[in-house]
């Protein structure tokens, strides 16, 4: 079982060899496409392969902002050829992510296919790591192999790579081990209850608030740190402001997501950026502690 997601992929190529990907769609090249063309081939060691975000079967929704559906395959290929002359292309790609059934806590293994020059899409953090503490996955690149498995998420502890324990391994060494892996990488992962935002911890409730700003401010101040796993919380509400008027948001509430983008593993600066680009309707996923200790 899978669900689909979309991501933007930027490739740098050249007029001679292009970007290293082939598309197919429709029945013939001059026919109007009724569904997006598919990536049918990725050339080894090409920009398309090295980016690590494209796979055969992905649907290309747009090329440099121009929708592929309702165009022809010839037009799509021409857009790629033109982009190669400019050395750069921006693709909007739809892909499948596995709906993995995984426990919210515990230790398990994840196997990921790996090519030498291709990143898995995992960022590991050693921020505020004490001796003997595990490395933490701080980010997973959208569209990457790691993302498509559906099993990994920011906050997961990375215990071992290909049976090499990482207990006292410096982050730089772990990154190097990951880079050098080929074919199939086996990651030993630990998920902790406190990493699961979805899991409603004792005395806490999660809910979503939709704010329509109508051109005005949201009326909230948020605080946190640049440490990936420090919580982002509401630190202030403008008196009679939009957020306060809802009656659903209070100082001390934790923000879990902004417009369905999880803040897990994201620093304060990214949360602020997400709010800035959120548009007219802003959806906040809030976690409220009900029985705050005195």
């Amino acid at each position: 079982i899978v669900h689909t997601e979309t991501t933007e992929v930027v490739l740098c190529g050249d007029p001679l060899s292009g970007f290293g990907l082939q598309l197919q769609g429709g029945i013939f090249a001059t026919e109007t496409l009724s569904s997006p063309p598919l990536v049918c081939f990725i050339e080894p060691d090409s920009p398309a392969e090295r980016c690590g975000l494209l796979q055969v079967g992905d649907r290309v929704l747009s090329i440099n902002g121009i929708a592929t559906e309702d165009g022809t395959m010839e037009e799509a290929n021409q857009l790629l050829r033109d982009a190669a002359l400019a050395h750069k292309v921006v693709l909007e790609v739809e892909f499948d992510v596995a709906e993995s059934v995984i426990p919210s806590s515990g230790t398990f293994h994840v196997k990921l296919p790996k090519k030498r020059s291709v990143e898995l899409g995992i960022t590991i953090s050693s921020a505020s790591r004490k001796r003997g503490e595990p490395l933490i996955i701080s980010d997973i690149k959208k569209g990457s192999v790691a993302h498509r498995t559906g099993t990994l998420e920011p906050g997961d502890k990375l215990l071992a790579i290909d049976n090499i324990r990482l207990d006292n391994c410096p982050m730089e060494d772990a990154v190097q081990i990951l880079r050098q892996c080929e074919d199939l990488v086996k990651l030993k992962i630990r998920k902790d209850e406190d990493n699961s935002d979805e899991l409603e911890t004792t005395g806490a409730v999660s809910y979503t608030v939709e704010l329509k700003r109508y051109g005005g401010p949201l009326g909230i101040t948020i605080s946190g740190t640049e440490e990936p796993f420090d919580p982002i919380v509401i630190s202030g509400l403008t008196k009679r402001g939009l957020a306060e008027r809802t009656g659903a948001i209070h100082v001390g509430d934790r923000i879990l997501a902004i417009n369905n983008v999880s803040l897990k593993g994201r620093p304060l600066s990214e949360a602020i950026h997400l709010l800035q680009v959120a548009g007219e309707t802003v959806t906040l996923k809030i976690k409220k502690q009900l029985d705050r200790p005195l």
Epitope: Q24, I27, S35
Partner: antibody, heavy 115, light 106 residues
């Protein structure tokens, strides 16, 4: 593993009808256009008909236009070819093939039109 | 409709030979040309797509070239398993196939 499996062929009299099916597995069926291609005994390949991934667009060779209807059921991962007013010259092995590059083919099903 | 003309219609060659089959379109089809191999009693198999791209799993002795109206399939060193019938097919407009080239053992 991508697999295409045709069925429904057989012996039919001129003027008769037959419905061919092609069961697909191993790929996202709805993302691909599909074609029917036929091959008369001892002859070359002839494209018959094609349908877009959504089923919204259909195309036919002039030789079968008005007599054959292509369709698909994406929920069943199955492609169909309804053949009416069959003629002796429609006798052939019928293959289904995937996509504009026809990168995967079924094993074929024989349709014989004879009295 | 776009007509595809293949030549030769039959060809005798020996193992190890370099073989070239040509295909001509009745109008420009850019690079929308595919090559297939078919053995008796079997379904066709895609060898080359988009004029020069080698299909996954196909030996590198097969290569394709050309654009516009003139295209070539080359087998650099014939192997015993290469004796078969080869078809070109355009996908620029509604698909059409060449009449086929039968490659036989000399």
């Amino acid at each position: 593993e991508v697999q295409l499996l045709e069925s429904g062929g057989g012996l039919v009299q001129p003027g008769g009808s037959l419905r061919l099916s092609c069961a697909a597995s191993g790929f996202t069926f709805s993302s691909y256009a599909m074609s029917w291609v036929r091959q008369a005994p001892g002859k070359g390949l002839e494209w018959v008909s094609a349908i877009s991934g959504s089923g919204g667009s259909t195309y036919y060779a002039d030789s079968v236009k008005g007599r054959f209807t292509i369709s698909r059921d994406n929920s069943k991962n199955t492609l169909y070819l309804q053949m009416n007013s069959l003629r002796a010259e429609d006798t052939a092995v019928y293959y289904c093939a995937r996509g504009s590059y026809m990168d995967y083919w079924g094993q074929g099903t024989l349709v014989t039109v004879s009295s | 409709d776009i007509q595809m003309t293949q030549s030769p219609s039959s060809l005798s060659a020996s193992v190890g030979d370099r073989v070239t089959i040509t295909c001509r379109a009745s109008q420009s089809i850019s690079s929308y040309l595919n090559w297939y191999q078919q053995k008796p009693g079997k379904a066709p198999k895609l060898l080359i797509y988009a004029a020069s791209s080698l299909q996954s799993g196909v030996p590198s002795r097969f290569s394709g070239s050309g654009s516009g109206t003139d295209f070539t399939l080359t087998i650099s060193s014939l192997q015993p398993e290469d004796f078969a019938t080869y078809y070109c097919q355009q996908s620029y407009g509604p698909p059409t196939f060449g009449q086929g080239t039968k490659l036989e053992i000399k």
